[in-house]
């Protein structure tokens, strides 16, 4: 799903207030709901009719440092016999997410939000066009 | 997928530097890759064998203000005849994402990261347990 543009109004102070100095804002330390956890069914990536693999990207200057991307294993979907059925399509499900980018020069550290496109998994769909009968 | 705990080390300055004053950091205005867009297949939520609906939650003090949650429509999956097959299971695919929470008291505005659990879509899986024969 798409994150709308900021238009930078979200990060501005009310008009009646003095502007933010130096184009930066105050970000409080700590993360709300930090202990909240993903609780998905077990091994859905291999049990799905549109199975996928995970690839981990790592960047120490990004939070979270680890971003996991899914890649659909097949073009078609897996049928009840465990065979690929190319009359159906495996398609990725994508999500825009925010990460925090750390920028430092010596002891001067600042942070900036960054939009990242994550493929979260795959789903099996009826094709729009039947290339294959 | 799960966002690891910060351990707050990510937001700390190097040990040789003076600590961050008042438990806050500098967040630069603007978003990197703001124009990046999701490019998913059309209407996958209704074409999927595990179809889903979207619900939008809105909060003006959150960025993004709009967070979209998916809910699977069926317990089973939709077969080639368009009927629900309860020998297969529709399951949600979840993703932890970051949002920014705005907190203001008069002209004093600060921001804090918040972890949100988003259901991005659904996929069809072979069941672990057969509730129904």
């Amino acid at each position: 799903r798409k994150i709308p543009k900021v238009g930078h109004t979200f990060f501005q102070k009310p008009e009646s207030c003095p502007p933010v100095p130096g184009g930066s804002m105050k970000l409080d330390i700590g993360i709300i709901n930090e202990n909240q956890r993903v609780s998905m069914s077990r091994n859905i990536e291999s049990r799905s009719t549109s199975p996928w693999n995970y690839t981990v990207t790592w960047d120490p200057n990004r939070y979270p440092s680890e971003v996991v991307q899914a890649q659909c294993r097949n073009l078609g979907c897996i049928n009840a016999q465990g065979k690929e059925d190319i009359s159906m399509n495996s398609v990725p499900i994508q999500q825009e997410t925010l990460v925090v980018r750390r920028k430092h020069q010596g002891c001067s550290v600042s942070f900036q939000l960054e939009k990242v496109l994550v493929t979260v998994g795959c789903t099996c769909v009826t094709p729009v066009i039947h290339h294959v009968q | 997928r799960k966002i690891p705990k910060v351990g707050h080390t990510f937001f700390q300055k190097p040990e040789s530097c003076p600590p961050v004053p008042g438990g806050s950091m500098k967040l630069d205005i603007g978003i990197i890759n703001e124009n990046q867009r999701v490019s998913m297949s059309r209407n996958i939520e209704s074409r999927s064998t595990s179809p889903w609906n979207y619900t939008v939650t809105w909060d003006p003090n959150r960025y993004p203000s709009e967070v979209v949650q998916a809910q699977c429509r069926n317990l089973g999956c939709i077969n080639a005849q368009g009927k629900e097959d309860i020998s297969m299971n529709s399951v949600p695919i979840q993703q932890e994402t970051l949002v920014v929470r705005r907190k203001h008291q008069g002209c004093s505005v600060s921001f804090q990261l918040e972890k949100v659990l988003v259901t991005v879509g659904c996929t069809c899986v072979t069941p672990v347990i057969h509730h129904v024969q």
């Epitope: 069914s41 | 699977c72 429509r73 069926n74 399951v91 949600p92 259901t119 347990i129």
Partner: nanobody, 123 residues
């Protein structure tokens, strides 16, 4: 914490009927299914029926198929279990719960249950 309140149980003769209801205080944004479960004395808790909030399709355990009917009222965040042709072996405490993964939900996925409602079927 989500609260679940089950009601409608009671003592009934074999062949009789009862209608259970369950109110869930807060549906999770992604929560899409509800289930009824039961636990007879000295036995493990077992699945009885499930329903999708959106699609409204229900599925049943073989032991209750054709006798029990599950329905839901989205506006009231309430699910029902109409139990007909009751048998002594239906005697148990009946619980409802959110099924976060639909039929893929296992008993291990739950960390909270309501108080349940006792159903006793005499012969």
């Amino acid at each position: 914490q989500v609260q679940l309140v089950e009601s409608g149980g009671g003592l009934v003769q074999a062949g009789g009927s009862l209608n259970l209801s369950c109110v869930i205080s807060r549906r999770t944004p992604s929560g899409y299914a509800m289930g009824w479960f039961r636990q007879a004395s000295g036995k493990e808790r077992e699945f009885v029926a499930a329903i999708s909030w959106i699609g409204g399709g229900a599925v049943y355990a073989d032991s209750v198929k054709g006798r029990f009917t599950m329905s839901r009222d989205n506006a009231k965040n309430t699910v029902y279990l109409q139990m007909n042709s009751l048998k002594p072996e239906d005697t148990a405490v009946y619980y409802c719960n959110d099924m976060p993964y639909g039929l893929d939900t296992t008993m291990d996925d739950y960390d909270y249950w309501g108080q349940g409602t006792q159903v006793t079927v005499s012969s």
